[in-house]
């Protein structure tokens, strides 16, 4: 049964390339474990960048190398992605599940654009 | 197409052991909670035991606790069911289901009798 | 005796509307949970009807309906066919036994 999930349109990475955004979905049940992926499509290609499953109430826990963080309240997630440069520039879309208890139930968002400006360098100071 | 595949039952005396098997096929097996669901001849559905996608919550029926065991192999889409000192009130078929019993297998007969 | 409560059995003439009761409680439709509801027909496996309390799979006609209300349920069967004479269960998650929770069972009888 799909769900609805909604997320920001478009958010500008900072100058450290760490880009923040909140992904809320409507929940039909009462879910006690959820599972968050982001995945990113940029030229009709859609790759995951980072999945964590948690337990309503506690942290989002991703893997160790994983350039995401997050934390959840309620039926909202709020995302970070770390690490980015300009190539990653694109279109960043929020899936959630609801695992536990059954029904299953999946919802994918309208992505977010995020924008990625690779900081100028430092001119020297000679 | 979901597919559910039950095997494993049979006649057994009081007492005896049973294990049965569901094997899965057209959907992601792993992402799914999985019951096990019996009807006694001439009576209504009973939820036995369920799983859920990650083995990490696992529930029984008041009857049955204690006496069956849930398991499933996501590698091999497959649920289980181990049935130990069976009772003649465990007659029944026996329902493979997944998610909230949205797609059922054809059951397996399970017949408890010396 | 189930968790679920339905009546044990109902009928109606061709082209009717017959409703089925499922009254449960704080633990599981009153908690929330969504109502699902399926069809046994003689001799066979039960097949989904209704599910998320008024969603209907693909290949189910619309003139079966679901609806919820506080700690109740109800399914909803119009213009009656003799094909409908079938078993009816409703079941939903129940948070104190940790699991899934069957109705009784309806029995539904097309008279005439």
């Known amino acids: 049964k799909a769900m609805h999930v909604a997320q920001p349109a478009v958010v500008l990475a900072n100058s450290r390339g760490t880009a923040s955004f909140v992904c809320e979905y409507a929940s039909p049940g009462k879910a006690t474990e959820v599972r968050v992926t982001v995945l990113r499509q940029a030229d009709s290609q859609v790759t995951e960048v980072c999945a964590a499953t948690y337990m309503m109430g506690n942290e989002l826990t991703f893997l160790d190398d994983s350039i995401c963080t997050g934390t959840s309240s309620g039926n909202q997630v709020n995302l970070t992605i770390q690490g980015l440069r300009a190539m990653d520039t694109g279109l960043y879309i929020c899936k959630v599940e609801l695992m536990y208890p059954p029904p299953y139930y999946m919802g994918i968002g309208n992505g977010t654009q995020i924008y990625v400006i690779d900081p100028e360098p430092c001119p020297d100071s000679d | 197409e979901v597919q559910l595949l039950e095997s494993g039952g049979g006649l057994v005396q009081p007492g005896g052991s049973l294990r049965l098997s569901c094997a899965a096929s057209g959907f992601t097996f792993s992402d799914y909670y999985m019951s096990w669901v019996r009807q006694a001849p001439g009576k209504g559905l009973e939820w036995v035991s369920g799983?859920?996608?990650?083995?990490?919550?696992?529930g029984y029926a008041d009857s049955v606790k204690g006496r069956f065991t849930i398991s499933r192999d996501n590698s091999k889409n497959t649920l289980y069911l181990q049935m130990n000192s069976l009772r003649a009130e465990d007659t029944a078929v026996y329902y493979c289901t997944t998610d909230l019993a949205r797609y059922w297998g054809q059951g397996t007969l399970v017949t408890v009798s010396s | 005796q189930s968790v679920l409560t339905q009546p044990p059995s109902a009928s109606g003439t061709p082209g009717q509307r017959v409703t089925i009761s499922c009254t449960g409680s704080s633990s599981n439709i009153g908690a929330g949970y969504d109502v699902h509801w399926y069809q046994q027909l003689p001799g066979t496996a039960p097949k989904l009807l209704i599910y998320g309390n008024d969603n209907r799979p693909s290949g189910v006609p619309d003139r079966f309906s679901g609806s919820k209300s506080g700690t109740s349920a109800s399914l909803a069967i119009s213009g009656l066919r003799s094909e409908d004479e079938a078993d009816y269960y409703c079941?939903?998650?129940?948070?104190?036994?940790?699991?899934?929770?069957f109705g009784g069972g309806t029995k539904l009888t097309v008279l005439g």
């Open positions: 079941a939903v998650w129940d948070d104190s036994l940790n699991g899934v929770v």
């Open positions: 799983i859920s996608w990650s083995s990490r919550d696992k």
